[in-house]
């Protein structure tokens, strides 16, 4: 039977009635709607937009439209005292501050509520000291400055340069390496590509732009004060000094004209090599401290934010299926922004509100999913996934037993070359067979679809003929859906070309020139990247919510195992003597791929042949399908870190945006060569293997007959 | 007794390719209970394990120097090879192959070494 039959439907009402109601014009209008004023998380203007969301959803169709609240933990500057950053002469005066917010954009001169670049979660103080260069901040960059250089950061203030890698695990390992400081700024190198103008000319960051972020090293955990819990009316909240993830030293962001007048007075040591050079005309030594002349003066921090407890509010919509109203098919995207969020998150937010319209075109004219489908608008996703997370928590046994599927709608674009996947493996082949049907919205494809244009400008790296998927990692809202709860996931947005593009993320990212006009006039003037965004996140949900036999093929499970079993072997096999001396083997990991291989296999062999007709048969079958993801997940969690529970895949543990596979045994042989006990570290290694290949064989046995 | 002989040049230029064969007598690589892998000592550092082919063809490379190695196996002859290109001098070692245990790191047979200079 067709999904039109399988609820009792005019073939009318199919995939192509949803595609083609699907309106590049309604997608500008709505993010020139959402971006008119600013929606801080906590603040009464993304309040009243999340009332407007809802009350336009309800008009949309949707079954119902609701609003979940929750009160976490977020942060504000200080309105009446600012932060910024000093150098202070021998005498202790201020002979350079740095600036106190961003010159407004045309236009946007006389808007209110504009929140000046800080770093959410700092803590408060005024710390003074030398100044130490790090590069990047990252694991790497520390263990260059302290192992190779010999240079401490204890008691020093450092200066990182964003990029490579997540913020929050910048300040992490400035913290580790004793700083008592931490100044952000984002390089030209990283954040202005050459050949193009600054804001508002083009789409290059200027001088006095800043990008905006919250530092946390969450983990999963949600609001700080309620780890595991909803932050609802009765919860029992962690003192400050228990709260998960906060930064124990000040942390604040500059733009390069302000970072400028820091670096270029550096001295001590010349950067180790040309890795370390950005592209301002500054020696970007080293330090620590000021070179000759200025070596007396000093760097000092005035940093004054504050942490409140604060409302936040998302919304829900449900549109419930006709013959599975128990199985959720979600998408989701947040809604609050740093500033205007132009991009962030606001052309992901309208793209989602176009798919709604579109579902609600279809309902209204008699036409149900087959499963229910549940769209949110998160709140507080830039403080630290709060909302999504909060409301994961507070439904978490019905999101165990019925979640399908999860697909995120944040930012839509990030550039315009090419499609960009990040998803479980059991979505590939969903994502291959709906990008061969959709049209490419590229230069030079017209006529061809979106798969081969794809495929041409982001081929995979292991497979000929195919585009490439990537691991999911975090930094977005489908953290504790995939990482946490194992419903199996999937975010897609047009992309930059990141061959010829070097700098991290866009220029403008979190900045206040992040506008309805930066991506009007120079990322996507027709709306036709969007449009494909939406094509693919609602196509996908479509078919994960309408298809009778879920479209998930557990066989491309059995082949990313297999490839991230060999990895990890041959990361271990760099210690070829202590792998002998504590008798490591990667045997049971090898043999249970194999049997999930074999098991797999079979499983899609059965899923070929079976009766799709007996309901009883197809409901197994598709719960074998759905809870596979699930049978990944180990309910102790991972070391140290017990919300991050997926044993195939985890954010890194030096960049929560990057996704690591079979995290555990990476993070057991990360720089095992320096563990002060080598037998106890290499006892750890074996431990995860053991979990990894139990993890594995177990998920391969929900596959198999189930009597 | 199974036995495992090195052989190629003891002498290579800068940025030129390193070449060595294995030939593997009283057993087969085609064997699926081992693998077949090169490692190499320099002198005052530990083993470094370069690679191995198993399966008759499957492959995995030590991380670090990936883009540079290439491990292939003939069956008919009884023999693996070792390809390492771009070398310099940090690549002066005694190069081993050897038999190991499928997913371990336990050489139970290995060649008796090659010395592999190199220098213009």
């Known amino acids: 039977k067709s999904s039109n039959e399988a609820t009792n439907i005019t073939p009318k009402h199919n995939m192509k009635a949803f595609l083609d109601e699907l309106k590049a014009e309604n997608i500008k209008k709505f993010l020139y709607n959402f971006t008119q004023i600013p929606h801080l998380a906590g603040t009464e203007q993304n309040f009243q937009l999340a009332k407007q969301i809802q009350s336009q959803w309800k008009e949309f169709g949707l079954d119902s439209v609701e609003l979940a609240h929750y009160d976490v933990l977020l942060s504000y500057p200080n309105k009446t005292h600012p932060n910024y950053i000093s150098i202070i002469n021998e005498d202790g005066n201020e002979i350079f501050n740095t600036s106190l917010f961003e010159p407004p954009p045309p236009g946007y001169e006389n808007v209110s509520d504009i929140v000046p670049p800080f770093s959410a979660f700092s803590p408060q103080g005024m710390p003074e000291g030398d100044l130490v260069y790090v590069n990047y901040a990252r694991t790497e960059d520390f263990f260059k400055l302290e192992r190779d250089m010999k240079i401490n950061c204890s008691g020093k203030i450092v200066i990182a340069r964003y990029g490579k890698v997540f913020r929050g695990n910048k300040v992490k390992n400035a913290q580790l390496a004793g700083a008592k400081g931490v100044i952000l700024y984002s390089d030209p190198a990283d954040y202005f590509a050459p050949g193009v103008k600054s804001y508002p000319d083009g789409w290059n960051l200027p001088g006095g732009g800043v990008q905006r972020g919250n530092i946390l090293n969450l983990n999963g955990a949600g609001d700080p004060l309620t780890p595991g819990y909803p932050a609802n009316e009765y919860a029992y909240r962690r003192g400050i000094a228990e709260a998960v993830g906060l930064p124990s030293i000040p942390v604040h962001p500059i733009g390069y004209y302000d970072a400028q007048k820091l670096l270029e007075k550096m001295g001590g040591s010349a950067p180790p090599d040309s890795s370390w050079r950005g592209s301002l005309k500054v020696p970007y030594n080293v330090g620590p401290g000021f070179t000759g002349n200025f070596s007396t003066q000093k760097v000092k921090m005035h940093i004054h934010s504050t942490n409140e407890v604060t409302r936040i509010y998302n919304v829900i919509g449900t549109l419930r299926g006709a013959v599975e109203p128990d199985r959720y098919v979600i998408l989701g995207g947040h809604r609050d922004s740093w500033v205007f969020g132009g991009i962030d998150p606001q052309s992901g937010a309208a793209v989602v509100h176009e798919i709604v319209r579109s579902f609600g075109t279809l309902k209204k004219e008699g036409w149900r999913p087959r499963r229910t489908i549940l769209f949110a608008s998160w709140d507080a996703e830039e403080f630290g996934l709060l909302g999504s997370t909060e409301w994961a928590e507070e439904n978490s046994r019905l999101l165990q037993e019925r979640g399908v599927a999860y697909i995120n709608a944040d930012s839509s674009i990030e550039g315009n070359y090419t499609l960009r996947v990040d998803c479980t493996p059991l979505m590939y082949s969903l994502v291959h067979n709906l990008t061969k049907e959709l049209k490419s919205p590229d230069e030079g494809f017209e006529g061809k679809s979106l798969y081969e244009s794809w495929t041409k400008k982001s081929p995979s790296p292991e497979f000929s003929g195919m585009p490439r998927i990537s691991k999911l990692g975090s930094g977005n809202d489908f953290e504790v859906f995939f990482q946490r709860l194992g419903i199996a996931s999937g975010r897609a947005r047009y992309t930059k070309n990141w061959e010829t593009n070097k700098f991290s993320g866009y220029p403008l990212y979190h900045s206040v020139y992040e506008t309805y006009e930066l991506v009007e006039k120079f990322y996507d003037p027709m709306f036709k990247y969007h449009l494909t965004v939406a094509q693919v996140r609602g196509g996908m949900v479509f078919e994960l919510a309408n298809s009778i036999v879920l479209p998930f093929d557990c066989r491309d499970y059995a082949v990313v195992l297999r490839k991230y079993a060999d990895k990890i072997y041959s990361i271990s096999m760099k210690h070829p003597q202590e792998m002998k001396t504590y008798s490591v083997s990667f045997d049971s990991l090898f043999s249970a791929v194999k049997n999930f291989t074999e098991i797999a296999s079979k499983f899609s062999e059965r899923l070929q042949d079976f009766d799709k007709s007996n309901p009883i048969v197809l409901r197994m079958m598709n719960d074998q399908l759905m809870f596979l993801e699930r049978a990944f997940i180990d309910p102790l969690g991972l070391p140290d870190r017990p919300f991050y529970r997926h044993v195939i895949y985890a954010p890194s543990s030096h960049n929560k945006y990057a996704g690591e596979s079979f995290p555990g045994i990476y993070d057991a042989l990360f720089d095992i060569e320096s563990k002060v006990d080598p037998s106890k570290a290499w006892g750890e290694v074996k431990r995860q293997i053991y979990v990894a290949a139990f993890t594995v064989q177990a998920a391969a046995e929900t596959l198999s007959e189930v009597a | 007794q199974l036995q495992l002989q090195e052989s190629g040049p003891g002498l290579v230029k800068p940025s030129e390719t390193l070449s060595l064969t294995c030939t593997v007598s009283?057993?087969?690589?085609?064997?699926?209970?081992?693998?077949w892998g090169w490692i190499r000592q320099s002198p005052g550092k530990g083993l470094e394990w370069l690679g191995s082919?198993?399966?008759?063809?499957?492959?995995h490379y030590n991380p670090s120097l990936k883009s540079r190695v290439i491990i292939s196996g003939d069956t008919s002859k009884n023999q693996f090879s070792l390809k390492l290109s771009s070398v310099t001098a940090a690549d002066t070692a005694v190069y081993y192959c050897?038999?190991?245990?499928?997913?371990?790191?336990?050489?139970?047979?290995r060649g008796q070494g090659t010395l592999v200079t190199v220098s213009s």
């Open positions: 050897a038999r190991h245990k499928a997913a371990t790191a336990d050489f139970d047979y």
């Open positions: 009283g057993g087969s690589i085609s064997s699926n209970s081992y693998y």
């Open positions: 082919i198993y399966d008759s063809g499957s492959t």
